[in-house]
C-alpha cells in the first residue's frame, strides 16, 4: 500500500541516527555519533486502481560525519518520513512512516555492508560503510599517516605532530574503472557491485526505482537506495548532495536546505521539515533566515530531537516518586497525597478519588476532578482524545499527533500551549478586582 494518495501527493525522506556501543537505547536518546537528513525524494501521487510501484526515494549518498574515533560497534535508527504536499494550512505536514533500528559491528575502512530491515509492511534495503577522513587511518580512524611520497612528517593543521605511521598502507586496488561509489573490492582486481548497481564496473543502475517497497503479493522489489549517481571520485558533495562532472571540475546539486560549492553550508528552512516529534516550525521562509522549532510537551533541542528528562526538574511534590513514561509524566505519591504532582493533601478533598492522574480541586464547597491529558469524565476514568480537554489556550487549535498533541496558536499568542499573549492589550500597572486578574479580560478563556 502506498503511503501517498491521489488526494495528498507526498514525497519521502530519511533521518539517520547513529549511537556508539551495543547498548539498547531508546529512540529519543541523543544521536551521539551523528545524525543526518536525506534530500527529499521525487513527488509521488497514487494513481487509483494502479498497482503499487516501488516508491520514488531520495537519491544520493547520505553522509553522517563523526567527530571522534569510530567506535567499531554502533546502533542505528533509520526513520522514513512522509511529507504531504497538499494545500493544508501552515504548509507541508510530516509524519513518521517507518522506523528501523539495529546494532552492528563495523570496522572503518572496510567494504560496503548490505542490510535489509523490515518495519510493518515496509522493507528497507540499504548499504553502509565507515570511512576515515585523511590523514586518519585504521579501523577506528585513530592513527595518522602520510602518503608514501609525502616529505614532511606533519600534515597541515597537526600541531604538535601526532604519532605518524611511517607510511600509509598501500590501498586495495580494485579493477581499473570500478565505480568508486557503486562498486567495491575485497580482493585486488575485482569489482563487486552495491545493491541496485550492475555491470563489470558497477556503473549501470539496475532500476531507477529504489528499495523501500511494500511487501506482499503485488510488490516489486527491484532496485534499492544506494549511493547517488555521478562519476565524481569520492563524492565531494556533503550533506547528501549529488555530484556531476563539468569540463573543468565538478558540480554539486545540493538537497534542499544546503548550499555552497560542496553543499557544506546549511540553509535549512521550515520547508525542509527540520522539527522532529511533532515540533511546529516557525520562520525561516528563505535560506538566510533562521527557523525555530516549537516543541510539543516532552521534547526539546533545536530540532525537538531530544526527550526532556522531566524528572530532573523534580516536579513531584511532598516526596512523590517521579516516573517519566515517555508519553506522560507520572508521580507516584506517598500515602495521603494525590494529584499529577502529589501537590494535594487528600484530606483537602475529603477522600475524593480522581483516577488516571486526575486532580481533585476544591471550589465553593464542592469538589471536582481536573483530569490529566487524555482522560475525562466525573472521575477521570474515561479515555479521551488528547485534544478533547482543549489543552490549547486562547483559541489555539489542537492537533492530535503520534507523539502527543501540538497547539497551533492564534495570532498574538505563543508558548507550547498558547498560554502567553505577546502583547496583552489594555494592560495596566495595577491589578483590579478580582485580585490578580487583569482588568478588562474575561475571567476564564480557552
Amino acid at each position: 500500500r502506498s503511503p501517498c494518495s491521489a488526494r495528498l501527493p507526498c514525497r519521502l525522506f530519511f533521518r539517520v541516527c547513529l549511537k556508539p556501543g551495543l547498548s539498547e537505547e531508546a529512540a529519543e536518546s541523543p544521536c551521539a555519533l551523528g545524525a543526518a537528513l536525506s534530500a527529499r525524494g521525487p513527488v509521488y501521487t497514487e494513481q487509483p486502481g494502479a498497482p503499487a510501484p516501488d516508491l520514488p526515494l531520495p537519491d544520493g549518498l547520505l553522509q553522517v560525519p563523526f567527530r571522534d574515533a569510530w567506535p567499531g560497534t554502533f546502533s542505528f535508527i533509520i526513520e522514513t518520513w512522509r511529507e504531504e504536499l497538499g494545500d493544508q494550512i501552515g504548509g507541508p505536514a510530516w509524519s513518521l512512516l517507518a522506523r528501523v533500528a539495529g546494532r552492528r559491528r563495523l570496522a572503518a575502512g572496510g567494504p560496503w555492508a548490505r542490510d535489509i530491515q523490515r518495519a510493518g509492511a515496509w522493507e528497507l534495503r540499504f548499504s553502509y560503510r565507515a570511512r576515515c577522513e585523511p590523514p586518519a587511518v585504521g579501523t577506528a580512524c585513530t592513527r595518522l599517516c602520510r602518503p608514501r611520497s609525502a616529505p614532511s612528517r606533519c600534515g597541515p593543521g597537526l600541531r604538535p605532530c601526532a604519532p605518524l605511521e611511517d607510511e600509509c598502507e598501500a590501498p586495495l586496488v580494485c579493477r581499473a574503472g570500478c565505480s568508486p561509489e557503486h562498486g567495491f573490492c575485497e580482493q585486488p582486481g575485482e569489482c563487486r557491485c552495491l545493491e541496485g548497481w550492475t555491470g563489470p564496473l558497477c556503473t549501470v543502475p539496475v532500476s531507477t526505482s529504489s528499495c523501500l517497497s511494500p511487501r506482499g503479493p503485488s510488490s516489486a522489489t527491484t532496485g534499492c537506495l544506494v549511493p547517488g549517481p555521478g562519476p565524481c571520485d569520492g563524492n565531494p558533495c556533503a550533506n547528501g548532495g549529488s555530484c556531476s562532472e563539468t569540463p573543468r571540475s565538478f558540480e554539486c546539486t545540493c538537497p534542499r536546505g544546503f548550499y555552497g560549492l560542496r553543499c557544506e553550508v546549511s540553509g535549512v528552512t521550515c520547508a525542509d521539515g527540520p522539527c522532529f516529534n511533532g515540533g511546529l516550525c516557525v520562520g525561516g521562509a528563505d535560506p538566510d533566515s533562521a527557523y525555530i522549532c516549537h516543541c510539543p510537551p516532552g521534547f526539546q533541542g533545536s530540532n525537538c530531537e531530544k526527550r526532556v528528562d522531566r524528572c530532573s526538574l523534580q516536579p513531584c511534590r511532598n516526596g512523590g516518586l517521579c516516573l517519566d513514561l515517555g508519553h506522560a509524566l507520572r508521580c507516584r505519591c506517598r500515602a495521603g497525597f494525590a494529584g499529577p504532582r502529589c501537590e494535594h493533601d487528600l484530606d483537602d478533598c475529603a477522600g475524593r478519588a480522581c483516577a488516571n492522574g486526575g486532580t481533585c480541586v476544591e471550589g465553593g464547597g464542592a469538589h471536582r476532578c481536573s483530569c490529566a491529558l487524555g482522560f475525562g469524565g466525573r472521575d477521570c476514568r474515561e479515555r479521551a482524545d488528547p485534544c478533547a480537554a482543549r489543552p490549547c489556550a486562547h483559541g489555539g487549535r489542537c492537533y492530535a499527533h503520534f507523539s502527543g498533541l501540538v497547539c497551533a496558536c492564534a495570532p498574538g499568542y505563543m508558548g507550547a500551549r498558547c498560554e502567553f499573549p505577546v502583547h496583552p492589550d489594555g494592560a495596566s500597572a495595577l491589578p483590579a478586582a478580582p485580585p490578580g486578574l487583569r482588568p478588562g479580560d474575561p475571567q476564564r478563556y480557552l
Epitope: R310, V361, E362, E419, G436, R444
Partner: nanobody, 117 residues
C-alpha cells in the same frame, strides 16, 4: 487564588546584569505556566520570556541570548536572569501566570528595572 510577588528590580549600568524573581503562592500553583512581561513608558506591555508547564521556553527576539528564564518547582518561583542590559530594557517588569486548572490569568504588581547609559 494565586498571588505573585516580584523582586530583584533596580538600577543598573548598561552592560550589567540583574536577576528578577517571582514567587507564586496560593492554591494549585503547580498548574502554572509562567512568564515575564515588561512595559516601558508610553508603550504596550510585551512578552519577554515564558516557561510552560513542560519546561519549554519562549523568548522575545530582542532578548534572545541575553535573558534566561528558569523555574524552581520546589519553591514555586520563576526567575529571569538578565545579562548585557541595555537602556532600552528599562521598563516595569511584571510576572504573569496562567493557571491551567481554571484557565485564569494572574499578574504581579511589577518591579522597576532602570538601565542607565
Amino acid at each position: 487564588q494565586v498571588q505573585l510577588q516580584e523582586s530583584g528590580g533596580g538600577l543598573v549600568v548598561a552592560g550589567g546584569s540583574l536577576r528578577l524573581s517571582c514567587a507564586a503562592s496560593g492554591s494549585s500553583v503547580s498548574f502554572l505556566s509562567m512568564a515575564w512581561y515588561r512595559q516601558a513608558p508610553g508603550k504596550k506591555r510585551e512578552l519577554v520570556a515564558g516557561i510552560s508547564t513542560d519546561g519549554s521556553t519562549n523568548y522575545a527576539d530582542s532578548v534572545k541570548g541575553r535573558f534566561t528564564i528558569s523555574e524552581d518547582n520546589a519553591k514555586n518561583t520563576v526567575d529571569l536572569q538578565m545579562n548585557s542590559l541595555q537602556p532600552e530594557d528599562t521598563a516595569v517588569y511584571y510576572c504573569y501566570a496562567y493557571r491551567w486548572i481554571d484557565r485564569y490569568t494572574y499578574w504581579g504588581q511589577g518591579t522597576q528595572v532602570t538601565v542607565s547609559s
